[in-house]
């Protein structure tokens, strides 16, 4: 008995209805009188809904669940959950017992969008350069807990002196309040972005304050949030910047780049000079820009093995560090298509179509479709092998029974570059040979 549920969580908005899909493969001669179907909470084993003795035994879960009775005989054991609440979030197990038995768990992820943030300042008048101001960003009634990001007018993240609190109301929805304490500069725009990590929904607001600049003492080390994507063989810049104090000189600077996981030294600057690359002589700093706070690292002739996290550590009197991710990528070649057998093909023949694409990274996603764009998922076998440089060759095999005529397309997608390489083959109803003879 095969019990199948979706691999990915089912995402449902608070107050809407959700379907937890579950299917099984009924044996020939199966009747509903033989069926035991139990939905229960995976962790506590609390009964949610059941079908037994040939009939729906109803909801044991706040009367908000229902089966699809007309579909049960075909093996559809899905559960409808009405008026979803935050408290419903979690794993539900679908257990099917006929003679054989099996179960599978499906996750329900509940979500609610956050409101547009409101911004308040304290103090909110007579602001002068050098004043410390508290900016509060508030957003309401979201779920799950939000991610809150602050940035300045240039889009540079502001991470220091941020306090974020999230409080759940009686329905389990969160109100988020994030407080940024800043010393006012010459002028500045401060933006608050409240992100719902499940819905990937961003709600943002900003405030602009315009007094004069006044210096701050702490070292702020900033790197890009998103991974740096670099093509194999090209050069990559891992950006890192810090905020030098007034009167700062390079003699005071310790800059260390290292691999985040192993702490292996990559490159360093200390005692007033560049100490050079400790990483295959493929790294360099930007010496002319260091005094302005640019601690970026240049990595030359990027290889697959370079992929990972690099930490930029800056020490003057104060110190700080931040990690930047390097994501390596290589585009896949245009797929080549082969047929087996490749001659005297007739309708009804079973043919093996192989789609091959080479030297890409990371592993590809392969999709097959027919001439109408309908996905072909059955009888597909895909293998990916890495060469000594870590680049993948992908071979995907589709077995089809030939119709009167047909076009079969293979799409090889690089998930990082979002680059699609495709090939297709058209087979006509007449006896034919592939590739077509000139």
């Amino acid at each position: 008995l095969e019990v199948q549920v979706p691999e990915d969580p089912v995402v449902a908005l608070v107050g809407t209805d959700a379907t937890l899909c579950c299917s099984f493969s009924p044996e020939p001669g199966f009747s509903l009188a033989q069926l035991n179907l139990i939905w229960q909470l995976t962790d506590t084993k609390q009964l949610v809904h059941s079908f037994a003795e040939g009939q729906d035994q109803g909801s044991a879960y706040a009367n908000r669940t229902a089966l699809f009775p007309d579909l049960l005989a075909q093996g559809n054991a899905s559960l409808r959950l009405q008026r979803v609440r935050v408290a419903d979030e979690g794993s539900f197990t679908c257990f099917v017992s006929i003679r054989d038995f099996g179960s599978a768990a499906v996750s329900l992820q509940v979500a609610a969008p956050y409101s547009k943030p409101s911004m308040t300042l304290e103090p909110n008048k007579d602001l002068r350069p050098g004043d410390t101001v508290t900016i509060t960003c508030s957003s309401y009634q979201g779920y799950p807990e939000a991610e809150v990001f602050w940035q300045d007018g240039q889009g540079v993240p502001l991470t220091g002196n941020v306090t974020t609190s999230q409080m759940a109301n009686e329905q389990g929805l969160f109100d988020v309040h994030s407080i940024l304490r800043v010393v006012l500069g010459a002028n500045g725009t401060y933006s608050c972005l409240v992100r719902n990590p499940v819905l990937q929904q961003d709600a943002h607001s900003s405030v602009t304050i315009t007094p004069q600049r006044s210096p701050t003492g702490a070292v702020e080390v900033q790197v890009p949030e998103d991974p740096v994507v670099a093509l194999v063989g090209t050069d990559a810049t891992l950006r890192c910047s810090f905020s030098p104090e007034p009167g700062f000189s390079l003699a005071q600077l310790n800059l260390i780049w290292q691999l985040t996981d192993t702490k292996q030294l990559v490159h360093s600057f200390t005692e007033g000079r560049d100490q050079g690359s400790a990483y295959a002589n493929r790294t360099a700093l930007f010496p002319d820009l260091l005094a302005q706070g640019n601690a970026s690292l240049r990595l030359q002739r990027v290889r697959v093995a370079d992929e990972g996290s690099f930490t930029c550590f800056v020490s003057i009197r104060d110190f700080g560090s931040a990690a930047v991710s390097l994501q390596v990528a290589a585009p896949y070649s245009k797929p080549s298509m082969t047929l087996e057998p490749n001659k005297d093909l007739r309708p009804g023949d079973t043919v093996t179509i192989t789609c091959s694409s080479y030297r890409g990274y990371p592993e590809a996603e392969v999709f097959w479709q027919d001439g109408q764009g309908v996905p072909l998922t059955g009888n597909v076998t895909t293998s990916q092998m890495a060469n000594e440089q870590g680049l993948f060759d992908v071979h995907s095999v589709l077995r089809v029974v030939l119709g009167a005529n047909g076009t079969y397309s293979c799409l090889v997608r690089n998930p990082v570059l979002q680059q699609d390489a495709h090939g297709s083959v058209t087979i006509t109803g007449q006896p034919m040979t592939f590739p077509p003879e000139a």
């Epitope: 095969e2 033989q34 035991n36 084993k45 035994q57 017992s97 003679r99 054989d100």
Partner: antibody
């Protein structure tokens, strides 16, 4: 005629391991779920583990979870129970049983496991 | 997990008597109950399944009834070969499929 024959029992020290086997015949093995049930000396029956016909679903008694592994080889018509980190309280006769329509309709004769130092 | 409470734990009776053994589940098991007979040193033998259905080869003096949480095994006109230990077992839901504690039926 349905036949289930267990083997692999014996004396083992606490913390040791043992693998029980159950040879099945007389029915289409891959179409039936199977269970292991044990009975400590002078005590009642205790369900231990179950595995579906295709081997893709397994279930365990909480007290053996992480220590026992139920598996099957449909090509060999065989059911197995790999037992590790054995404790004195695992001492019992272990039976394999065929699952019918929500019932254990056929049982083996049992194999004895003694955990003692 | 579902608990199965079997009573009595032991019972003395004579040949020709009628005896009743009960089994109570901690929640509704929708008739997903089996009864087994076990003799000393032997493997259990299936008597009834789905609460009321007699297994192949089991004499008709054995019968089962019940629904929901409460189930009963009755033996009419006890025979000498019926003196044994009897167990109920539920098959409702995701395992564990627990047994009752057993009822030892002895000759008076």
């Amino acid at each position: 005629e349905v036949q289930l024959v267990e083997s692999g029992g014996g004396l083992v020290k606490p913390g040791g391991s043992l693998r029980l086997s159950c040879a099945a015949s007389g029915f289409t093995f891959s179409s039936y779920g199977m269970s292991w049930v044990r009975q400590a000396p002078g005590k009642g029956l205790e369900w231990v583990a179950a595995i579906s016909g295709g081997g893709n679903y397994t279930y365990y008694l909480d007290s053996v979870k992480g220590r026992f592994t139920i598996s099957r080889d449909n090509a060999k018509n065989s059911l197995y129970l790999q037992m590790s980190s054995l404790r004195a309280e695992d001492t019992a006769v272990y039976y394999c049983a065929r699952q019918g329509l929500r019932v254990m309709d056929n049982w083996g004769q049992g194999t004895s496991v003694t955990v003692s130092s | 997990d579902i608990q199965m409470t079997q009573s009595p734990s032991s019972l003395s009776a004579s040949v020709g008597d009628r005896v009743t053994i009960t089994c109570r589940a901690s929640e509704n098991i929708y008739s997903n109950l089996a009864w087994y007979q076990q003799k000393q040193g032997k493997a259990p033998k299936l008597l009834l399944y789905a609460a009321t259905n007699l297994a192949d080869g089991v004499p008709s003096r054995f019968s089962g009834s019940g629904s929901g949480t409460d189930y009963t095994l009755k033996i009419n006109s006890l025979q000498p070969e019926d003196f044994a230990t009897y167990y109920c077992q539920h098959f409702w839901g995701i395992p564990p499929w627990t047994f009752g504690g057993g009822t030892k039926l002895e000759i008076k």
